[in-house]
């Protein structure tokens, strides 16, 4: 049994990191490995990781973690047994993805305006929630090559659009991911979509 | 929200033994080490024990060492301190703490052991 | 073992003056991947002691931005921006490079 694929592991900088890797071949991920990590700091202790299978050959192990700072390293040892596949180490600050935004909800009531509005993932005493910024996409159910992308750079985790920028009449969805530019994370995955009609009031035309 | 409460102290002759326990809540237990921490009246902290998570490793300040045990029942989310040969320089509160990062995150009220004939 | 040497042993101080209180350390708490093995503590009168400031210089939960942590090596100070009131207590640092965790003697911080 050999690792094909070493471990990569990203941090959601809260209380979990997930490592996925690949193996030589077809592996029961939870029956016969085992991923430990342990903090670097004096009297820590290591904890056990029950790997899941993610495809064949692919295992995906949820490190729990506490609230994460900069100076958090683990060391990661990965065993079949009593025997030691692979040993590395992981500094969750430096491979950041960010938790998918929640709650995304369109009010349509505000005159001719679309209000998309959704949740920070985080808590207000975690250091990311001051520190996302979001892509918001919105497509039409009907036209596939009516596809874009809002980025909102600011911290409010909203967007207002102009309803008559999109086509009257038709369904549309939206979905929303996140950010933090501060530890250069990865974006988030989309959030849930939601869906909604749009119509609104097309305005005279002047001849 | 985290809480460690100390319990067991009190009036006790030199030679004698006490055991003090710290019940902890509001945080997986078997997932930190833990340590005691004692407070002579008027004087400054002075570090006793610690234990891992597991239990499996304990940690002593060479003072203590053969005089003072510690041990932990994670199923009762519990820490101990076994305090035997008791001095009049063992008089002191007893504070629990919650270890994360080698420092301590959490602290306990403290148990007050008096030696005294 | 290490030495934990703080000072001044009482500091009075004016509400709403910065204070700093020093502690060195017999040998360097510095490790491996940059970070300082020092932290700091507060311990009001009748209560027991809370953290302020872990490895060296970052403040812990909970903890007004008033105090700072800073240092390397053998040489760290806490710094209170602005002293209030409720600050009064004693401060210790304690190092986390190896057991025995060692504390410094304490320095009392009381109002003028």
């Known amino acids: 049994m050999k690792v094909l694929q070493e471990p990569t592991c990203v941090s959601d900088y809260m209380s979990i990191s997930t490592c996925e890797w690949k193996m030589n071949g077809p592996t029961n991920c939870s029956t016969e490995l085992r991923l430990l990590y342990q903090l670097v700091f004096l009297l820590s202790e290591a904890h056990t990781c029950i790997p899941e299978n993610n495809g064949g050959a692919g295992c995906v192990c949820h490190l729990l973690m506490d609230d994460v700072v900069s100076a958090d390293n683990y060391t990661l040892d990965l065993w079949a047994g009593q025997q030691l596949l692979w040993k590395g180490s992981f500094k969750p600050s430096e491979h950041v993805k960010p938790r998918a935004p929640g709650n995304l909800t369109v009010h349509t009531n505000v005159s001719d305006t679309l209000l998309l509005t959704w949740s920070n993932p985080y808590p207000p005493d975690n250091y990311l929630y001051n520190h996302l910024t979001y892509a918001v996409n919105i497509w039409s159910e009907n036209d596939p090559a009516d596809f874009r992308i809002y980025n909102v750079t600011y911290l409010e985790p909203s967007l207002r659009i102009a309803a008559s920028t999109l086509k009257s009449g038709i369904s549309y969805r939206a979905r929303v991911r996140a950010w933090a530019q501060c530890y250069n994370t990865t974006w988030s995955e989309w959030s849930p979509s939601t869906k909604w009609h749009n119509s609104y009031r097309e305005p005279f035309e002047q001849h | 929200e985290v809480q460690l409460v100390e319990s067991g102290g009190g009036l006790v002759q030199p030679g004698g033994s006490l055991r003090l326990s710290c019940a902890a809540s509001?945080?997986?237990?078997?997932?930190?080490?833990v340590s005691w921490v004692r407070q002579a009246p008027g004087k400054g902290l002075e570090w006793v024990s610690a234990?891992?998570?597991?239990?499996?490793?304990?940690y002593y300040a060479d003072s203590f060492k053969g005089r003072f045990t510690i041990s932990r029942d994670n199923s009762k989310n519990t820490l101990y301190l076994q305090l035997n040969s008791l001095r009049a320089e063992d008089t002191a509160v007893y504070y629990c703490?919650?270890?994360?990062?080698?420092?301590?995150?959490?602290w306990g009220q403290g148990t007050l052991v008096t030696v005294s004939s | 073992d290490i030495v934990m040497t703080q000072s001044p042993l009482s500091l009075p101080v004016t509400p709403g003056e910065p204070a700093s209180i020093s502690c060195k350390s017999s040998?360097?708490?510095?490790?491996?991947?940059?970070?300082?093995?020092l932290d700091w503590y507060l311990q009001k009168p009748g209560q027991s002691p809370q953290l302020l400031i872990y490895?060296?210089?970052f403040t812990a939960k909970g903890v007004p931005d008033r105090f700072s942590g800073s240092g390397s090596g053998t040489d760290f100070t806490l710094k209170i921006s602005r002293v209030e009131a409720e600050d009064v207590g004693i401060y210790y640092c304690?190092?986390?490079?190896?057991?025995?965790?060692?504390f410094g003697g304490g320095t009392k911080v009381e109002i003028k």
């Open positions: 703490a919650r270890v994360l990062r080698g420092g301590f995150w959490d």
């Open positions: 234990i891992g998570g597991s239990g499996g490793k304990t």
């Open positions: 509001g945080f997986t237990f078997s997932r930190y080490a």
């Open positions: 490895l060296g210089s």
């Open positions: 304690m190092q986390t490079l190896q057991t025995p965790l060692t």
């Open positions: 040998q360097s708490l510095l490790e491996g991947q940059g970070y300082n093995r």
